[in-house]
Protein backbone atom coordinates (compact mmCIF):
# COMPACT_ATOMS: atom_id res chain seq x y z
CA UNK A 1 0.00 0.00 0.00
CA UNK A 2 1.31 3.45 -0.89
CA UNK A 3 2.29 5.86 1.87
CA UNK A 4 0.20 8.67 0.42
CA UNK A 5 -1.86 9.14 -2.69
CA UNK A 6 -2.49 12.45 -4.42
CA UNK A 7 -5.76 12.13 -6.26
CA UNK A 8 -6.86 14.46 -9.04
CA UNK A 9 -10.19 12.90 -9.96
CA UNK A 10 -10.82 15.02 -13.04
CA UNK A 11 -8.75 14.23 -16.11
CA UNK A 12 -10.07 17.36 -17.75
CA UNK A 13 -12.15 20.39 -16.90
CA UNK A 14 -13.88 22.60 -19.45
CA UNK A 15 -14.65 26.18 -18.44
CA UNK A 16 -16.09 29.14 -20.29
CA UNK A 17 -13.95 32.27 -20.41
CA UNK A 18 -14.81 34.62 -17.56
CA UNK A 19 -16.02 31.82 -15.31
CA UNK A 20 -14.34 30.03 -12.40
CA UNK A 21 -12.44 26.76 -12.77
CA UNK A 22 -12.45 24.24 -9.93
CA UNK A 23 -9.39 22.02 -9.86
CA UNK A 24 -9.93 19.11 -7.49
CA UNK A 25 -7.24 17.38 -5.49
CA UNK A 26 -7.29 15.19 -2.42
CA UNK A 27 -4.50 13.54 -0.49
CA UNK A 28 -5.00 10.45 1.57
CA UNK A 29 -2.69 11.68 4.32
CA UNK A 30 -0.81 14.64 5.70
CA UNK A 31 2.16 12.32 6.16
CA UNK A 32 4.85 12.73 5.03
CA UNK A 33 4.74 16.22 6.47
CA UNK A 34 5.08 18.95 3.88
CA UNK A 35 3.08 21.34 1.75
CA UNK A 36 0.90 20.76 -1.27
CA UNK A 37 1.40 23.15 -4.16
CA UNK A 38 -0.33 23.60 -7.51
CA UNK A 39 1.56 23.99 -10.77
CA UNK A 40 0.66 24.46 -14.40
CA UNK A 41 2.76 22.25 -16.61
CA UNK A 42 5.48 19.82 -15.63
CA UNK A 43 9.23 19.90 -15.57
CA UNK A 44 11.62 22.71 -14.73
CA UNK A 45 9.60 25.35 -16.55
CA UNK A 46 6.40 24.69 -14.67
CA UNK A 47 4.45 27.67 -13.31
CA UNK A 48 3.51 27.92 -9.64
CA UNK A 49 -0.24 28.49 -9.40
CA UNK A 50 -0.79 28.27 -5.68
CA UNK A 51 1.28 27.85 -2.55
CA UNK A 52 -0.60 27.94 0.74
CA UNK A 53 2.25 29.34 2.78
CA UNK A 54 3.78 32.13 0.75
CA UNK A 55 3.14 34.25 -2.32
CA UNK A 56 0.22 36.28 -3.58
CA UNK A 57 -2.36 34.49 -5.71
CA UNK A 58 -5.32 36.88 -6.02
CA UNK A 59 -7.29 34.76 -8.48
CA UNK A 60 -7.00 31.55 -6.48
CA UNK A 61 -9.27 30.51 -3.65
CA UNK A 62 -9.24 27.24 -1.75
CA UNK A 63 -12.15 24.85 -1.74
CA UNK A 64 -12.50 22.44 1.10
CA UNK A 65 -14.95 19.58 1.27
CA UNK A 66 -14.89 19.20 5.02
CA UNK A 67 -17.26 16.28 5.05
CA UNK A 68 -14.75 13.74 3.74
CA UNK A 69 -13.34 11.84 6.68
CA UNK A 70 -10.83 9.74 4.80
CA UNK A 71 -8.88 12.34 2.88
CA UNK A 72 -7.67 15.91 2.79
CA UNK A 73 -9.05 18.37 0.30
CA UNK A 74 -6.51 20.53 -1.49
CA UNK A 75 -8.76 21.71 -4.29
CA UNK A 76 -8.55 25.23 -5.65
CA UNK A 77 -10.70 27.59 -7.66
CA UNK A 78 -9.25 29.95 -10.25
CA UNK A 79 -11.45 32.93 -11.03
CA UNK A 80 -12.01 34.93 -14.22
CA UNK A 81 -10.61 32.27 -16.52
CA UNK A 82 -9.14 33.36 -19.85
CA UNK A 83 -7.85 31.25 -22.76
CA UNK A 84 -4.33 31.93 -21.49
CA UNK A 85 -5.12 29.77 -18.43
CA UNK A 86 -5.48 26.62 -20.52
CA UNK A 87 -3.05 23.84 -19.69
CA UNK A 88 -2.47 20.87 -17.42
CA UNK A 89 -2.53 21.57 -13.70
CA UNK A 90 -0.74 19.37 -11.18
CA UNK A 91 -1.37 19.03 -7.47
CA UNK A 92 2.03 18.22 -5.96
CA UNK A 93 2.86 16.99 -2.47
CA UNK A 94 6.24 17.98 -1.04
CA UNK A 95 8.12 16.38 1.81
CA UNK A 96 9.77 18.68 4.31
CA UNK A 97 13.49 18.68 3.77
CA UNK A 98 16.57 20.63 4.71
CA UNK A 99 17.20 23.18 3.41
CA UNK A 100 14.45 22.79 0.77
CA UNK A 101 11.30 20.73 0.57
CA UNK A 102 11.50 17.75 -1.76
CA UNK A 103 8.82 16.87 -4.27
CA UNK A 104 7.22 13.69 -3.01
CA UNK A 105 4.26 12.87 -5.22
CA UNK A 106 2.21 14.51 -7.94
CA UNK A 107 -1.36 14.00 -8.96
CA UNK A 108 -2.05 12.73 -12.47
CA UNK A 109 -2.92 16.23 -13.64
CA UNK A 110 -6.09 17.96 -14.76
CA UNK A 111 -6.24 19.47 -18.21
CA UNK A 112 -8.03 22.81 -18.14
CA UNK A 113 -9.62 23.69 -21.45
CA UNK A 114 -11.12 27.12 -21.85
CA UNK A 115 -14.14 27.73 -24.00
CA UNK A 116 -13.89 31.25 -25.35
CA UNK A 117 -16.46 32.85 -27.60
CA UNK A 118 -15.38 34.16 -30.98
CA UNK A 119 -15.47 37.91 -31.41
CA UNK A 120 -18.23 39.38 -33.57
CA UNK A 121 -17.32 38.66 -37.19
CA UNK A 122 -16.11 41.72 -39.07
CA UNK A 123 -16.88 41.71 -42.79
CA UNK A 124 -15.01 44.02 -45.10
CA UNK A 125 -15.39 44.50 -48.81
CA UNK A 126 -13.16 45.83 -51.58
CA UNK A 127 -11.62 49.27 -51.26
CA UNK A 128 -13.03 50.42 -54.61
CA UNK A 129 -16.50 50.04 -56.03
CA UNK A 130 -17.13 47.59 -58.82
CA UNK A 131 -19.78 47.35 -61.50
CA UNK A 132 -22.27 44.54 -62.17
CA UNK A 133 -20.92 41.34 -63.66
CA UNK A 134 -17.66 41.86 -61.84
CA UNK A 135 -16.49 39.51 -59.08
CA UNK A 136 -15.52 41.11 -55.78
CA UNK A 137 -13.94 39.66 -52.64
CA UNK A 138 -15.24 40.00 -49.11
CA UNK A 139 -13.26 39.04 -46.02
CA UNK A 140 -14.59 37.93 -42.66
CA UNK A 141 -12.52 37.78 -39.48
CA UNK A 142 -13.25 36.57 -35.97
CA UNK A 143 -10.79 36.13 -33.13
CA UNK A 144 -10.16 34.80 -29.65
CA UNK A 145 -12.15 31.57 -29.70
CA UNK A 146 -11.38 28.21 -28.18
CA UNK A 147 -11.58 25.29 -28.81
CA UNK A 148 -10.37 25.40 -32.42
CA UNK A 149 -13.39 23.79 -34.06
CA UNK A 150 -15.54 26.43 -35.73
CA UNK A 151 -17.90 26.67 -38.70
CA UNK A 152 -18.11 29.66 -41.02
CA UNK A 153 -20.73 30.20 -43.75
CA UNK A 154 -21.34 32.96 -46.26
CA UNK A 155 -24.73 34.15 -47.46
CA UNK A 156 -25.94 36.66 -50.00
CA UNK A 157 -29.51 37.70 -49.34
CA UNK A 158 -30.11 34.47 -47.45
CA UNK A 159 -28.65 32.27 -50.15
CA UNK A 160 -25.58 30.33 -49.10
CA UNK A 161 -22.43 31.02 -51.07
CA UNK A 162 -19.98 28.33 -52.03
CA UNK A 163 -17.03 30.22 -53.46
CA UNK A 164 -14.95 31.00 -50.40
CA UNK A 165 -11.74 29.98 -48.65
CA UNK A 166 -11.30 29.80 -44.89
CA UNK A 167 -8.27 29.50 -42.61
CA UNK A 168 -8.11 28.95 -38.86
CA UNK A 169 -4.88 30.07 -37.23
CA UNK A 170 -2.65 28.95 -35.73
CA UNK A 171 -2.52 25.43 -37.11
CA UNK A 172 -1.00 23.97 -33.92
CA UNK A 173 -2.04 24.10 -30.29
CA UNK A 174 -2.86 27.54 -28.96
CA UNK A 175 -4.76 29.16 -26.13
CA UNK A 176 -7.10 30.78 -28.66
CA UNK A 177 -7.67 30.89 -32.39
CA UNK A 178 -8.65 33.22 -35.22
CA UNK A 179 -10.59 32.56 -38.40
CA UNK A 180 -10.18 34.37 -41.70
CA UNK A 181 -12.35 33.75 -44.72
CA UNK A 182 -12.53 35.28 -48.20
CA UNK A 183 -15.65 34.94 -50.33
CA UNK A 184 -16.09 35.81 -54.00
CA UNK A 185 -19.34 37.50 -55.02
CA UNK A 186 -20.54 38.29 -58.54
CA UNK A 187 -22.38 41.63 -58.60
CA UNK A 188 -25.65 42.18 -60.42
CA UNK A 189 -27.50 45.40 -61.20
CA UNK A 190 -30.03 44.50 -58.50
CA UNK A 191 -27.47 44.33 -55.69
CA UNK A 192 -27.83 47.82 -54.25
CA UNK A 193 -30.10 46.46 -51.52
CA UNK A 194 -28.20 43.19 -51.19
CA UNK A 195 -26.31 42.07 -48.10
CA UNK A 196 -23.42 39.70 -47.70
CA UNK A 197 -23.45 37.86 -44.37
CA UNK A 198 -20.66 35.94 -42.67
CA UNK A 199 -22.02 33.50 -40.06
CA UNK A 200 -19.82 31.90 -37.42
CA UNK A 201 -20.96 28.91 -35.35
CA UNK A 202 -19.00 27.73 -32.30
CA UNK A 203 -19.65 25.44 -29.34
CA UNK A 204 -19.66 28.45 -26.98
CA UNK A 205 -22.54 30.09 -28.84
CA UNK A 206 -25.09 27.40 -27.96
CA UNK A 207 -26.62 27.22 -31.41
CA UNK A 208 -26.96 30.97 -31.81
CA UNK A 209 -24.34 31.90 -34.40
CA UNK A 210 -22.68 35.28 -34.67
CA UNK A 211 -23.15 37.27 -37.87
CA UNK A 212 -21.26 40.01 -39.57
CA UNK A 213 -22.75 41.87 -42.51
CA UNK A 214 -21.67 44.04 -45.40
CA UNK A 215 -24.07 46.03 -47.54
CA UNK A 216 -23.36 45.75 -51.23
CA UNK A 217 -24.47 49.37 -51.50
CA UNK A 218 -20.95 50.15 -50.21
CA UNK A 219 -19.40 48.06 -52.97
CA UNK A 220 -21.46 48.35 -56.11
CA UNK A 221 -21.49 51.03 -58.76
CA UNK A 222 -24.32 50.85 -61.29
CA UNK A 223 -23.49 53.11 -64.24
CA UNK A 224 -26.34 55.14 -65.68
CA UNK A 225 -28.05 54.76 -69.01
CA UNK A 226 -28.66 58.03 -70.85
CA UNK A 227 -31.47 59.07 -73.15
CA UNK A 228 -31.74 62.52 -74.76
CA UNK A 229 -35.06 63.50 -76.23
CA UNK A 230 -36.58 66.60 -77.79
CA UNK A 231 -39.87 67.74 -76.32
CA UNK A 232 -42.61 69.66 -78.15
CA UNK A 233 -42.35 73.41 -78.68
CA UNK A 234 -43.29 75.25 -75.51
CA UNK A 235 -43.45 78.67 -77.09
CA UNK A 236 -42.46 80.40 -80.28
CA UNK A 237 -38.88 79.37 -81.16
CA UNK A 238 -38.43 77.33 -77.92
CA UNK A 239 -37.46 73.67 -77.79
CA UNK A 240 -37.21 71.57 -74.64
CA UNK A 241 -34.46 68.94 -74.69
CA UNK A 242 -34.29 66.43 -71.80
CA UNK A 243 -31.55 64.09 -70.70
CA UNK A 244 -32.89 61.15 -68.72
CA UNK A 245 -30.26 59.53 -66.51
CA UNK A 246 -31.56 56.18 -65.41
CA UNK A 247 -30.66 53.34 -63.04
CA UNK A 248 -27.47 54.64 -61.46
CA UNK A 249 -25.88 54.11 -58.06
CA UNK A 250 -24.49 55.75 -55.99
CA UNK A 251 -26.12 59.16 -56.27
CA UNK A 252 -22.93 61.12 -56.90
CA UNK A 253 -23.39 62.38 -60.44
CA UNK A 254 -22.56 65.51 -62.44
CA UNK A 255 -24.16 66.39 -65.74
CA UNK A 256 -22.87 68.81 -68.34
CA UNK A 257 -24.77 70.10 -71.38
CA UNK A 258 -22.67 70.82 -74.46
CA UNK A 259 -23.86 72.79 -77.50
CA UNK A 260 -21.82 71.98 -80.53
CA UNK A 261 -19.05 70.85 -78.17
CA UNK A 262 -19.10 73.93 -76.00
CA UNK A 263 -20.06 73.72 -72.32
CA UNK A 264 -23.49 75.17 -71.83
CA UNK A 265 -24.26 74.23 -68.23
CA UNK A 266 -23.05 71.88 -65.48
CA UNK A 267 -25.21 70.63 -62.66
CA UNK A 268 -25.10 68.08 -59.88
CA UNK A 269 -27.82 65.50 -59.35
CA UNK A 270 -29.92 66.60 -56.42
CA UNK A 271 -33.60 65.82 -56.55
CA UNK A 272 -33.43 62.22 -57.68
CA UNK A 273 -36.06 59.55 -57.68
CA UNK A 274 -35.28 56.15 -56.22
CA UNK A 275 -36.21 52.93 -57.93
CA UNK A 276 -37.35 49.80 -56.10
CA UNK A 277 -33.98 48.20 -56.65
CA UNK A 278 -32.22 51.08 -54.94
CA UNK A 279 -30.86 52.72 -58.07
CA UNK A 280 -31.67 56.33 -58.95
CA UNK A 281 -33.20 58.21 -61.89
CA UNK A 282 -32.67 61.83 -62.67
CA UNK A 283 -33.67 64.16 -65.46
CA UNK A 284 -32.17 67.37 -66.71
CA UNK A 285 -33.38 69.58 -69.50
CA UNK A 286 -32.48 72.55 -71.63
CA UNK A 287 -34.84 75.17 -73.09
CA UNK A 288 -33.46 76.22 -76.44
CA UNK A 289 -34.53 79.26 -78.52
CA UNK A 290 -33.97 78.58 -82.15
CA UNK A 291 -34.13 80.90 -85.10
CA UNK A 292 -35.00 79.88 -88.59
CA UNK A 293 -31.39 80.07 -89.47
CA UNK A 294 -30.04 77.80 -86.85
CA UNK A 295 -31.22 74.21 -87.10
CA UNK A 296 -27.90 72.40 -86.94
CA UNK A 297 -27.34 72.50 -83.16
CA UNK A 298 -25.76 69.34 -81.70
CA UNK A 299 -26.73 69.00 -78.03
CA UNK A 300 -24.72 66.61 -75.90
CA UNK A 301 -25.64 65.35 -72.39
CA UNK A 302 -22.39 64.36 -70.68
CA UNK A 303 -22.51 62.55 -67.35
CA UNK A 304 -19.69 61.92 -64.93
CA UNK A 305 -20.84 59.29 -62.40
CA UNK A 306 -19.05 58.60 -59.15
CA UNK A 307 -15.74 59.92 -60.40
CA UNK A 308 -15.68 57.60 -63.42
CA UNK A 309 -14.87 58.71 -66.98
CA UNK A 310 -17.75 60.64 -68.53
CA UNK A 311 -20.36 59.00 -70.72
CA UNK A 312 -22.42 61.05 -73.12
CA UNK A 313 -25.38 61.00 -75.44
CA UNK A 314 -25.94 63.53 -78.24
CA UNK A 315 -29.02 64.87 -79.96
CA UNK A 316 -29.24 66.86 -83.18
CA UNK A 317 -31.76 69.59 -82.63
CA UNK A 318 -34.61 69.32 -85.14
CA UNK A 319 -36.36 72.59 -85.76
CA UNK A 320 -39.52 72.77 -87.93
CA UNK A 321 -42.80 74.67 -87.88
CA UNK A 322 -44.47 71.95 -85.83
CA UNK A 323 -41.88 69.71 -84.21
CA UNK A 324 -42.92 66.14 -83.63
CA UNK A 325 -43.65 65.27 -79.99
CA UNK A 326 -41.05 63.03 -78.42
CA UNK A 327 -41.12 61.53 -74.92
CA UNK A 328 -42.87 62.99 -71.95
CA UNK A 329 -43.51 66.63 -71.35
CA UNK A 330 -43.52 66.38 -67.60
CA UNK A 331 -40.04 67.79 -67.35
CA UNK A 332 -41.31 71.10 -68.63
CA UNK A 333 -43.19 71.48 -65.37
CA UNK A 334 -40.02 71.25 -63.32
CA UNK A 335 -39.13 74.57 -61.78
CA UNK A 336 -35.55 73.55 -61.77
CA UNK A 337 -35.39 73.89 -65.55
CA UNK A 338 -32.82 76.08 -67.16
CA UNK A 339 -33.21 78.20 -70.25
CA UNK A 340 -30.58 78.65 -72.87
CA UNK A 341 -31.04 81.01 -75.77
CA UNK A 342 -29.46 80.24 -79.11
CA UNK A 343 -29.34 82.99 -81.79
Amino acid sequence: EEELQVIQPDKSVLVAAGETATLRCTATSLIPVGPIQWFRGAGPGRELIYNQKEGHFPRVTTVSDLTKRNNMDFSIRIGNITPADAGTYYCVKFRKGSPDDVEFKSGAGTELSVRAKPSAPVVSGPAARATPQHTVSFTCESHGFSPRDITLKWFKNGNELSDFQTNVDPVGESVSYSIHSTAKVVLTREDVHSQVICEVAHVTLQGDPLRGTANLSETIRVPPTLEVTQQPVRAENQVNVTCQVRKFYPQRLQLTWLENGNVSRTETASTVTENKDGTYNWMSWLLVNVSAHRDDVKLTCQVEHDGQPAVSKSHDLKVSAHPKEQGSNTAAENTGSNERNIY
Epitope: E1, E2, E3, L4, T28, S29, L30, I31, P32, V33, G34, P35, I36, Q52, T61, T62, V63, S64, L66, R69, N70, N71, M72, D73, F74, S75, I76, R95, K96
Partner: antibody, heavy 118, light 112 residues
Framework: EVQLVESGGGLVKPGGSLRLSCAAS????????MSWVRQTPGKGLEWVAT????????YYPDSVKGRFTLSRDNAKNSLYLQMNSLRAEDTAVYYC???????????WGQGTTVTVSS | DIVLTQSPASLAVSLGERATISCRAS??????????MHWYQQKPGQPPKLLIY???NLESGVPDRFSGSGSRTDFTLTINPLQAEDVATYYC??????????FGGGTKVEIK
Amino acid sequence: EVQLVESGGGLVKPGGSLRLSCAASGFTFSSYVMSWVRQTPGKGLEWVATISSGGTYTYYPDSVKGRFTLSRDNAKNSLYLQMNSLRAEDTAVYYCASQLTGSEFDYWGQGTTVTVSS
Amino acid sequence: DIVLTQSPASLAVSLGERATISCRASESVDLYGTSFMHWYQQKPGQPPKLLIYRASNLESGVPDRFSGSGSRTDFTLTINPLQAEDVATYYCHQSSDELPWTFGGGTKVEIK
Protein backbone atom coordinates in the same frame (compact mmCIF):
# COMPACT_ATOMS: atom_id res chain seq x y z
CA GLU B 1 -14.36 -3.03 16.65
CA VAL B 2 -11.16 -0.98 16.62
CA GLN B 3 -8.76 -1.92 19.39
CA LEU B 4 -5.36 -0.53 20.31
CA VAL B 5 -3.64 -2.27 23.21
CA GLU B 6 -0.42 -0.81 24.61
CA SER B 7 2.14 -2.77 26.61
CA GLY B 8 5.72 -2.48 27.83
CA GLY B 9 5.34 0.33 30.34
CA GLY B 10 6.92 0.21 33.75
CA LEU B 11 9.43 1.70 36.12
CA VAL B 12 12.85 2.51 34.77
CA LYS B 13 15.84 4.43 36.08
CA PRO B 14 16.95 7.67 34.38
CA GLY B 15 19.20 6.87 31.42
CA GLY B 16 17.51 3.52 31.03
CA SER B 17 15.49 2.12 28.11
CA LEU B 18 12.02 0.76 27.51
CA ARG B 19 10.24 -0.60 24.47
CA LEU B 20 6.53 0.05 24.19
CA SER B 21 4.33 -2.01 21.91
CA CYS B 22 0.87 -1.38 20.49
CA ALA B 23 -1.19 -4.23 19.08
CA ALA B 24 -3.86 -3.11 16.61
CA SER B 25 -7.01 -4.89 15.48
CA GLY B 26 -10.38 -4.13 13.92
CA PHE B 27 -9.05 -1.91 11.11
CA THR B 28 -6.61 -1.98 8.21
CA PHE B 29 -3.50 -1.17 10.18
CA SER B 30 -1.25 -0.78 7.11
CA SER B 31 -3.41 2.09 5.83
CA TYR B 32 -3.07 4.18 8.96
CA VAL B 33 -0.52 6.66 10.13
CA MET B 34 0.26 5.74 13.73
CA SER B 35 1.39 7.88 16.64
CA TRP B 36 2.22 7.95 20.31
CA VAL B 37 0.84 10.67 22.55
CA ARG B 38 1.74 10.96 26.20
CA GLN B 39 -0.05 12.59 29.10
CA THR B 40 1.47 13.93 32.26
CA PRO B 41 -0.47 15.48 35.10
CA GLY B 42 1.62 18.64 34.79
CA LYS B 43 1.94 19.02 31.02
CA GLY B 44 -1.34 17.65 29.69
CA LEU B 45 -1.27 15.92 26.31
CA GLU B 46 1.96 15.90 24.31
CA TRP B 47 2.60 14.43 20.88
CA VAL B 48 5.59 12.07 21.00
CA ALA B 49 6.09 10.37 17.63
CA THR B 50 4.40 9.59 14.31
CA ILE B 51 5.13 7.03 11.60
CA SER B 52 3.75 6.88 8.08
CA SER B 53 1.53 4.01 6.99
CA GLY B 54 4.35 2.24 5.19
CA GLY B 55 6.90 2.96 7.89
CA THR B 56 9.12 5.12 5.70
CA TYR B 57 8.70 8.44 7.47
CA THR B 58 8.95 9.15 11.16
CA TYR B 59 8.52 12.42 13.05
CA TYR B 60 9.39 13.48 16.58
CA PRO B 61 9.24 16.65 18.63
CA ASP B 62 12.57 18.08 19.74
CA SER B 63 11.93 16.84 23.29
CA VAL B 64 12.43 13.18 22.27
CA LYS B 65 14.34 13.44 18.99
CA GLY B 66 17.46 11.28 19.01
CA ARG B 67 16.31 9.30 22.03
CA PHE B 68 13.07 7.69 20.85
CA THR B 69 12.67 5.52 17.75
CA LEU B 70 9.30 4.59 16.28
CA SER B 71 8.82 1.54 14.06
CA ARG B 72 6.02 -0.70 12.85
CA ASP B 73 5.44 -4.18 11.55
CA ASN B 74 2.41 -4.14 9.28
CA ALA B 75 2.46 -7.91 8.93
CA LYS B 76 1.96 -8.17 12.70
CA ASN B 77 -0.31 -5.11 13.01
CA SER B 78 2.10 -3.81 15.61
CA LEU B 79 3.64 -0.48 16.52
CA TYR B 80 6.81 -0.08 18.60
CA LEU B 81 8.37 2.82 20.46
CA GLN B 82 11.96 2.30 21.54
CA MET B 83 12.78 4.79 24.30
CA ASN B 84 16.43 5.31 25.24
CA SER B 85 18.19 7.71 27.56
CA LEU B 86 15.01 8.13 29.55
CA ARG B 87 14.59 11.16 31.74
CA ALA B 88 12.32 11.95 34.68
CA GLU B 89 10.29 14.27 32.45
CA ASP B 90 9.41 11.31 30.22
CA THR B 91 7.23 9.97 33.03
CA ALA B 92 3.69 9.80 31.63
CA VAL B 93 0.86 7.62 30.39
CA TYR B 94 1.71 6.71 26.79
CA TYR B 95 -1.17 6.31 24.37
CA CYS B 96 -1.00 4.61 21.01
CA ALA B 97 -3.26 6.46 18.55
CA SER B 98 -4.28 5.94 14.92
CA GLN B 99 -4.57 8.63 12.27
CA LEU B 100 -6.31 7.60 9.08
CA THR B 101 -5.25 10.80 7.34
CA GLY B 102 -2.25 11.75 9.42
CA SER B 103 -4.37 14.49 10.90
CA GLU B 104 -6.74 13.95 13.84
CA PHE B 105 -6.25 11.05 16.21
CA ASP B 106 -9.17 8.75 15.41
CA TYR B 107 -8.71 5.99 17.95
CA TRP B 108 -6.73 5.76 21.17
CA GLY B 109 -5.55 2.84 23.25
CA GLN B 110 -6.09 2.70 27.01
CA GLY B 111 -2.49 3.73 27.64
CA THR B 112 0.53 2.29 29.39
CA THR B 113 2.33 4.04 32.22
CA VAL B 114 6.04 4.81 32.08
CA THR B 115 7.74 5.97 35.24
CA VAL B 116 11.31 7.19 35.12
CA SER B 117 12.69 7.43 38.61
CA SER B 118 15.83 6.57 40.49
CA ASP C 1 5.77 25.90 17.66
CA ILE C 2 2.07 26.67 17.38
CA VAL C 3 0.78 27.35 20.88
CA LEU C 4 -2.86 26.56 21.63
CA THR C 5 -4.46 28.54 24.43
CA GLN C 6 -7.70 27.14 25.77
CA SER C 7 -10.15 29.15 27.82
CA PRO C 8 -11.56 28.90 30.34
CA ALA C 9 -9.46 26.35 32.22
CA SER C 10 -12.63 25.16 33.92
CA LEU C 11 -16.31 25.74 33.33
CA ALA C 12 -19.40 25.04 35.42
CA VAL C 13 -22.67 24.98 33.46
CA SER C 14 -26.20 24.00 34.44
CA LEU C 15 -27.68 20.92 32.90
CA GLY C 16 -29.52 21.77 29.69
CA GLU C 17 -27.54 24.97 29.25
CA ARG C 18 -24.88 25.81 26.68
CA ALA C 19 -21.19 25.26 27.36
CA THR C 20 -18.71 27.13 25.17
CA ILE C 21 -14.98 26.46 25.08
CA SER C 22 -12.49 28.58 23.16
CA CYS C 23 -9.17 27.62 21.61
CA ARG C 24 -6.83 30.23 20.17
CA ALA C 25 -3.80 29.29 18.03
CA SER C 26 -0.66 31.43 17.94
CA GLU C 27 -0.77 31.19 14.13
CA SER C 28 -3.15 29.96 11.47
CA VAL C 29 -3.81 26.23 11.30
CA ASP C 30 -5.66 26.49 7.98
CA LEU C 31 -4.51 24.64 4.89
CA TYR C 32 -6.41 25.02 1.63
CA GLY C 33 -9.50 26.21 3.40
CA THR C 34 -9.46 23.37 5.90
CA SER C 35 -8.78 24.17 9.54
CA PHE C 36 -6.68 21.43 11.06
CA MET C 37 -8.08 21.89 14.54
CA HIS C 38 -9.69 19.01 16.40
CA TRP C 39 -11.47 18.52 19.71
CA TYR C 40 -11.24 15.59 22.13
CA GLN C 41 -13.15 14.60 25.23
CA GLN C 42 -11.40 12.82 28.08
CA LYS C 43 -13.19 11.38 31.05
CA PRO C 44 -11.29 10.38 34.21
CA GLY C 45 -9.39 7.11 33.80
CA GLN C 46 -10.09 6.95 30.05
CA PRO C 47 -8.13 7.86 26.93
CA PRO C 48 -9.16 10.93 24.90
CA LYS C 49 -11.96 10.46 22.39
CA LEU C 50 -12.31 12.34 19.10
CA LEU C 51 -15.41 14.57 19.00
CA ILE C 52 -14.84 17.09 16.23
CA TYR C 53 -12.32 16.89 13.43
CA ARG C 54 -11.11 19.70 11.18
CA ALA C 55 -12.88 22.45 13.09
CA SER C 56 -16.51 21.59 12.42
CA ASN C 57 -17.01 17.95 11.45
CA LEU C 58 -18.78 15.72 13.92
CA GLU C 59 -17.08 12.37 14.36
CA SER C 60 -19.29 9.36 13.71
CA GLY C 61 -21.25 8.29 16.78
CA VAL C 62 -20.84 11.61 18.60
CA PRO C 63 -24.13 13.27 19.67
CA ASP C 64 -25.07 16.33 17.65
CA ARG C 65 -25.25 18.50 20.76
CA PHE C 66 -21.52 18.86 20.18
CA SER C 67 -20.51 21.32 17.50
CA GLY C 68 -17.33 23.04 16.40
CA SER C 69 -16.68 26.26 14.56
CA GLY C 70 -13.94 28.69 13.66
CA SER C 71 -11.07 29.11 11.24
CA ARG C 72 -7.45 30.20 11.08
CA THR C 73 -6.64 30.99 14.74
CA ASP C 74 -9.93 31.12 16.64
CA PHE C 75 -12.02 28.05 17.36
CA THR C 76 -14.95 27.14 19.54
CA LEU C 77 -16.41 23.91 20.88
CA THR C 78 -20.06 24.17 21.92
CA ILE C 79 -22.08 21.68 23.92
CA ASN C 80 -25.78 22.46 23.82
CA PRO C 81 -27.63 21.32 25.80
CA LEU C 82 -25.14 20.07 28.37
CA GLN C 83 -25.89 16.58 29.71
CA ALA C 84 -24.57 14.90 32.86
CA GLU C 85 -22.41 12.49 30.82
CA ASP C 86 -20.58 15.45 29.24
CA VAL C 87 -18.65 16.11 32.43
CA ALA C 88 -15.06 15.70 31.24
CA THR C 89 -11.93 17.57 30.22
CA TYR C 90 -11.90 18.84 26.62
CA TYR C 91 -8.74 19.38 24.57
CA CYS C 92 -8.12 21.13 21.28
CA HIS C 93 -5.35 19.83 19.00
CA GLN C 94 -3.77 21.23 15.85
CA SER C 95 -2.23 19.08 13.12
CA SER C 96 -1.18 21.60 10.51
CA ASP C 97 1.84 20.77 8.37
CA GLU C 98 4.11 22.62 10.76
CA LEU C 99 5.52 20.25 13.36
CA PRO C 100 5.33 19.75 16.26
CA TRP C 101 1.66 19.05 16.60
CA THR C 102 0.34 20.55 19.81
CA PHE C 103 -2.56 20.34 22.24
CA GLY C 104 -4.36 22.96 24.29
CA GLY C 105 -4.06 22.87 28.06
CA GLY C 106 -7.58 21.48 28.47
CA THR C 107 -10.89 22.79 29.82
CA LYS C 108 -12.61 20.97 32.65
CA VAL C 109 -16.42 21.04 32.31
CA GLU C 110 -18.54 20.47 35.42
CA ILE C 111 -22.21 20.68 36.30
CA LYS C 112 -23.26 23.80 38.16
